[in-house]
């Protein structure tokens, strides 16, 4: 590490003075930073002398030496008062400039130690300083200003007490940059547009800074805008505002808009969709199936997606039948606007009931006209079964009838014994009845089918069952003979 | 309607000034630039300069800045040019233009013709 | 500043027939930003103010008849009015809107016989 003759860590010196300062190191050793005209500087072997015959307070200030040969890197310092009576600053800087929460040295150097105890910091010509400035004070360095505020960027001076009056130093402007975080915030309105040719429109950009110095810019497709731009400063931020106000829109006038706001910390945009029309519009879809099919018992949510420009005066949900004159119950319908220019109207329709089942229709209306989309809803039921014993033209004939929706497909089994229901290990027989008659299908009603099974004598001790099923589910009846007859065969199939 | 309104017509001595106004209507007047346009007895049109109407940035052709003075007052949607130290040669027809967005002349005042005479 | 020359100064046509009329600027005037021209033509009747006729070189204002049609690019553009009424009598100005000053042309004056 350098040493530096004489020792310091401080000197005092009068105007007028020869000083020497030696830096003497195992190598060779420089002096850091400019060196100020009133110096000489020579070398004398591993040392470097640095020596004015005139010192004045301008050489008041830290002079450090270094060896740069010196793998650890050492210095050596001292600091250098030159106490001159009418001098008491020697200020290194005019202009400061930090950014915002950073500490701010304001390098004016005291030329007499003494002096320390009645030095202080003020704004240009006296002016205290604002509240909530906390600073401190070093002789070497001068005085920082903690964590300075944009507010704290002005002009200062530092003062001392020099038999009784206070001597100021020629001021310092202390420039207080605000942090851009990033790019200007921005806000682009509408999100979309929909006009009506001839129509007015209006589309607004505005930027919001926390410094004056950015620029906005509204763009159709690739066209920059030539726009008037609004100032204005509020919430601590700076804003600029450009409004695009159209008297009657053209088709020329749709297409794609972004506004564009760039600082030094980059660029930012956002876009959005200008439509003209030529004509209000109503369309009315739907995501799901038109025609719709649902267990009894079960909830179905009945949902139409609505787009138009101008808006909905009117909309509704209405039973068209075939059952009841009810109408669904306003609670149950539902409608969301997931933008500007599109909604979602949705009807519940929980626990369905059998006279719920028919002609659903969502109806709209705008200056575009009504619309309608109606919905077909028919309840699905498990078969419901039923059989007798009957004769048809002097034959024995058992008759199965089989009622829900789906249309029910019918099996005849014949089991052993006596039983409500043949299960697997007593079947005997199995007959299935490829076409069944159809006695009854409506719309939004079960299909009702009928199955005929002819016997002249059913035998005794066995059981016949009718089994009928579809996608809901099944149902069966078994009919147990009274008495036994002569074994038949049943008919072809 | 949109509509620019001009004052009438101005008869001025040599040296004086004068301040001709144009009152829009029919639209915002503080979303357009305006522009001045002069036209000497029938001959080619002339680009004065135009202004914002928020905050009174001018930007003037070099050939007449220190002669037109652009000024705006927003409250009554009404723009104006002073003209200063007229000569016979600012004799002409001033015409007051809004900049369309997307930056042609798209609606043009009547115009207001001056003479420079003793 | 950009000079806009037109030529010819002036033409007289009966009506029926097809006229072009030229305009050229000292530079270009394609707009890099969106590939337009900055270029736009008025119409001045007398004792009006001009009217605007067609911008960006080729686009035709709302409300002007299909029989004005605009062309060029770069430096060298066009106004042909396919089939001349008695009302087009008027002088024709072009204008670059490519960059201040804006300048106009020197106008052509069109007659009818």
């Known amino acids: 590490i350098p040493v530096i003759e004489p020792s310091g860590p401080e000197l005092v010196v009068k105007p007028g003075e020869t000083v020497t300062l030696r830096c003497v190191g195992n190598g060779s050793v420089e002096w850091d930073g400019p060196i100020s005209p009133h110096w000489t500087l020579y070398s004398d072997g591993p040392s470097s002398v640095l020596t004015t015959n005139n010192a004045t307070f301008q050489n008041t200030r830290t002079y450090r030496c270094t060896e740069p040969g010196d793998p650890l890197g050492g210095s050596a310092a001292i600091h250098l008062y030159v106490k001159d009576p009418a001098r008491p600053w020697n200020v290194l800087a005019k202009e400061v400039v930090v950014f915002e929460d950073q500490d701010a040295l304001l390098p004016c150097l005291l030329t007499d130690p003494v002096l320390e105890a009645g030095v202080s910091l003020v704004r240009l010509r006296g002016r205290p300083l604002l509240r909530h400035t906390n600073y401190s004070f070093s002789p070497w360095h001068g005085f920082i200003i903690h964590r300075a505020k944009f507010i704290q960027g002005q002009d200062y001076q530092c003062s001392a007490l020099m038999g009784g009056r206070k001597v100021m130093s020629i001021s310092i402007r202390l420039k207080v940059q605000k942090v851009i975080p990033g790019p200007p915030a921005l806000t682009l309105v509408p999100a979309e547009l929909v006009r009506i040719r001839g129509e007015a429109a209006q589309i607004v950009c505005s930027a919001s800074n926390i410094d004056v110095d950015f620029d906005v810019f509204l763009q159709h497709n690739t066209t920059k805008l030539a726009i008037p731009q609004r100032s204005d400063f509020h919430d601590n931020r700076y804003q600029k505002v450009l409004t695009l106000s159209l008297g009657q829109v053209d088709f020329q006038h749709a297409g794609n808009y972004s506004c564009v706001a760039s600082n030094v910390q980059g660029k930012h945009s956002t876009s959005m969709f200008f439509q003209v029309v030529e004509s209000a519009y109503l369309d009315l879809s739907s995501e799901q199936n038109l025609i719709q099919e649902v267990t009894v018992g079960e909830g179905l949510n009945l949902k139409v997606m609505v787009e138009a420009y101008p808006g909905l005066q009117g909309f509704n949900w209405t039973y068209l039948g075939p059952f009841s004159d009810h109408q669904p119950e306003p609670k149950l319908a539902n409608a969301t606007t997931k933008d500007t220019y599109r909604h979602t109207f949705t009807l519940s329709l929980p626990r369905l009931k059998p006279s719920e089942a028919g002609r659903y229709s969502f109806l709209a209306r705008n200056p575009g006209g009504w619309r309608a989309l109606t919905f077909e809803l028919t309840l699905r039921y498990p078969p419901e079964v039923s059989v007798i014993w009957t004769s048809i033209n002097g034959s024995g004939t058992l008759l199965c009838a089989a009622s829900g929706y789906p249309q029910p497909n019918v099996t005849w089994l014949q089991c052993a014994g006596h039983t409500d229901r043949c299960d697997e290990a007593q079947v005997l027989q199995v007959w299935v009845d490829p076409h069944p008659e159809v006695l009854s299908q409506e719309p939004f009603q079960k299909v009702t089918v009928q199955s005929l099974l002819t016997a002249e004598t059913l035998e005794h001790n066995q059981t016949y069952e009718c089994r009928a099923h579809n996608s809901v589910g099944s149902g069966s009846w078994a009919f147990i003979p009274i008495s036994a007859g002569a074994r038949t065969h049943p008919p072809d199939e | 309607e949109v509509q620019l309104q001009q004052s009438g017509p101005e008869l001025v001595k040599p040296g004086a000034s004068v301040k001709i106004s144009c009152k829009a209507s029919g639209y915002t007047f503080s979303n357009y630039y305006m522009n001045w346009v002069n036209q000497r007895h029938g001959e080619r049109l002339e680009w004065i300069g135009e202004m914002n109407p928020n905050n009174g940035d001018s930007s003037y052709n070099q050939k007449f800045k220190g002669k037109a003075t652009l000024t705006v007052d927003k409250s009554s949607s009404t723009a104006y040019m002073e003209l200063r130290s007229l000569t016979s040669e600012d004799s002409a027809v001033y015409y007051c233009?809004?900049?369309?967005?997307?930056?042609?002349?798209?609606?043009w005042g009547p115009g207001t013709t001056v003479i420079v005479s003793s | 500043d950009i000079v806009m020359t037109q030529s010819p100064s002036s033409l007289t046509v009966t009506a029926g027939e097809k006229v072009t009329m030229s305009c050229k600027s000292s530079q270009s005037l394609l707009n890099s930003g969106n590939q337009k021209n900055s270029l736009t033509w008025y119409q001045q009747k007398p004792g009006q103010p001009p009217k605007l006729l067609i911008y960006?070189?080729?686009t035709r204002e709302s409300g002007v008849p299909d029989r004005f049609t605009g062309s060029g690019s770069g430096t060298d553009f066009t106004l042909t009015i396919s089939s001349v009424q008695t009302e087009d009598l008027a002088v024709y100005y072009c204008?670059?809107?490519?960059?201040?000053?804006?300048?106009f042309g020197t106008g052509t004056k069109l007659e009818i016989k």
């Open positions: 204008q670059n809107d490519y960059t201040y000053p804006f300048t």
């Open positions: 960006w070189a080729s």
């Open positions: 233009a809004r900049r369309s967005p997307w930056w042609f002349f798209d609606v």
